[in-house]
């Protein structure tokens, strides 16, 4: 299992919607004994490790799991739409969060976390991260622009 980020930087004018995406590459575990816990959160670029500090996004804590007996359980505590958010996971391994009507306060480092659970044991914690920069309307573009990561930044962070 590997987590990659197609884009590492999103630059958006205020008021736009933006979809941040992590891609879960799961060639080995498909159909086997692995389950996944997934979440999105805000963080900061720590001195040692990115995505170590967890803060809720718009005061929302997302919970999503892929469990064999319940293939796609979106276990968020209330509807993300109430917070102007949408969280999605598709069959191609795209795990995304959409922020509607972004404001300057939405700027920050966004992290996706995927925990691979095998035989009830959390085997690995994999992170993907990207930065969202929200700009004031004056003189900025009318749509969001996404920038791909440098080659060395494209792989996920793994924490045992």
């Amino acid at each position: 299992i590997k987590v990659t980020t197609p884009y590492s930087l999103y630059v958006c004018p205020e008021g736009q919607n933006v979809t941040l995406t992590c891609r879960i590459l799961d060639s080995v575990s498909k159909g086997h004994d692995a389950n996944f816990l997934k979440t999105w959160f805000l963080s900061s670029r720590g001195e040692v490790q990115v995505c170590k500090e967890h803060r809720p996004i718009r005061n929302f804590i997302s919970h999503h799991q892929h469990h064999r007996s319940h293939p796609a359980v979106n276990a968020s505590h209330d509807q993300p739409q109430k917070h102007g958010l949408e969280i999605a996971y598709d069959n191609h391994g795209n795990f995304s969060i959409t922020l509607h009507n972004v404001t300057l306060s939405d700027s920050g480092l966004y992290c996706c976390l995927v925990i691979e659970v095998k035989h009830h044991h959390p085997e690995r914690r994999l992170y993907g991260y990207m930065e969202l920069q929200v700009q004031t309307g004056k003189g900025s573009a009318s749509t969001c622009t996404a920038y791909p990561p440098n080659e060395q930044d494209s792989d996920s962070i793994t924490a045992a």
Epitope: E53, Q65, H77
Partner: antibody
């Protein structure tokens, strides 16, 4: 093996400040995890008081926020609880526990210490 | 704050029987965690993230549910399962909240 041990006075007078310390062995409190205080009473059951994170940021139960301070002493690998203006309703067994960021459950607990508020 | 209501408050069953403990949330929660507490001891984590047993927990313990209704099942009771069982959520935070507990007697 990670161990947590609470210490502090077992008897506190009404209106005084309750002070407890949790000593952590086998793991550095600055490495990871959130370090929590939880109390248990026969009437209210288990109640989360608040926590301090590995980086030193704190979060408190809104119902107690005005009276609670959680701090840490990294040199001693300890974190502490102060609860001011105590009343008989604060009589409880106080425990410290650690929780990993996501999926947020308490995996290691201290044995707990009983605090009675009485004059 | 999200209130977790556990039922039944007490449950008395015989060894080998199946126990079903309920944890109902006042509004939809993410994961539910379950703990076992015996007299004079600290709570011991049993199940995390609704489904998953923590290290050393026998397979007779299982968790299920989603949204507002979650269940802890003990498939074949042993005398040492006598304890108080608590559920906990960290979805709406702060505060983290616990259920009021179910006291299970196996005799």
């Amino acid at each position: 093996q990670v161990q947590l041990q609470e210490s502090g006075p077992g008897l506190v007078k009404p209106s005084d400040t309750l002070s407890l310390t949790c000593t952590v062995s086998g793991y550095s409190i600055t490495s990871d995890y959130t370090w929590n205080w939880i109390r248990q009473t026969p009437g209210k059951g288990l109640e989360w008081i608040g926590h301090i994170t590995y980086s030193g940021s704190v979060s408190y139960n809104p119902s107690l926020r005005s009276r609670v301070t959680i701090s840490r002493d990294t040199s001693k690998n300890q974190f502490s609880l102060k609860l001011s203006s105590v009343t008989a309703a604060d009589t409880a067994t106080y425990s410290c526990a650690r929780a990993l960021y996501y999926p947020w459950y308490f995996d290691v607990w201290g044995t707990g210490t009983t605090v009675t508020v009485s004059s | 704050e999200i209130v977790l209501t556990q039922s039944p408050a007490t449950l008395s069953l015989s060894p080998g029987e199946r126990a079903t403990l309920s944890c109902r949330a006042s509004s939809s929660v993410g994961y539910i965690h379950w703990y076992q507490q015996k007299p004079g001891q600290a709570p011991r984590p049993l199940i995390y993230a609704t489904y998953y047993r923590t290290t050393g927990i026998p397979a007779r313990f299982s968790g299920s549910g989603s949204g507002t209704d979650n269940t802890l099942t003990i498939s074949s009771l042993e005398p040492e399962d006598s304890a108080v069982y608590y559920c906990q959520q960290w979805s709406s935070y702060p505060p983290i909240t616990f259920g009021g507990g179910t006291k299970l007697e196996v005799k």
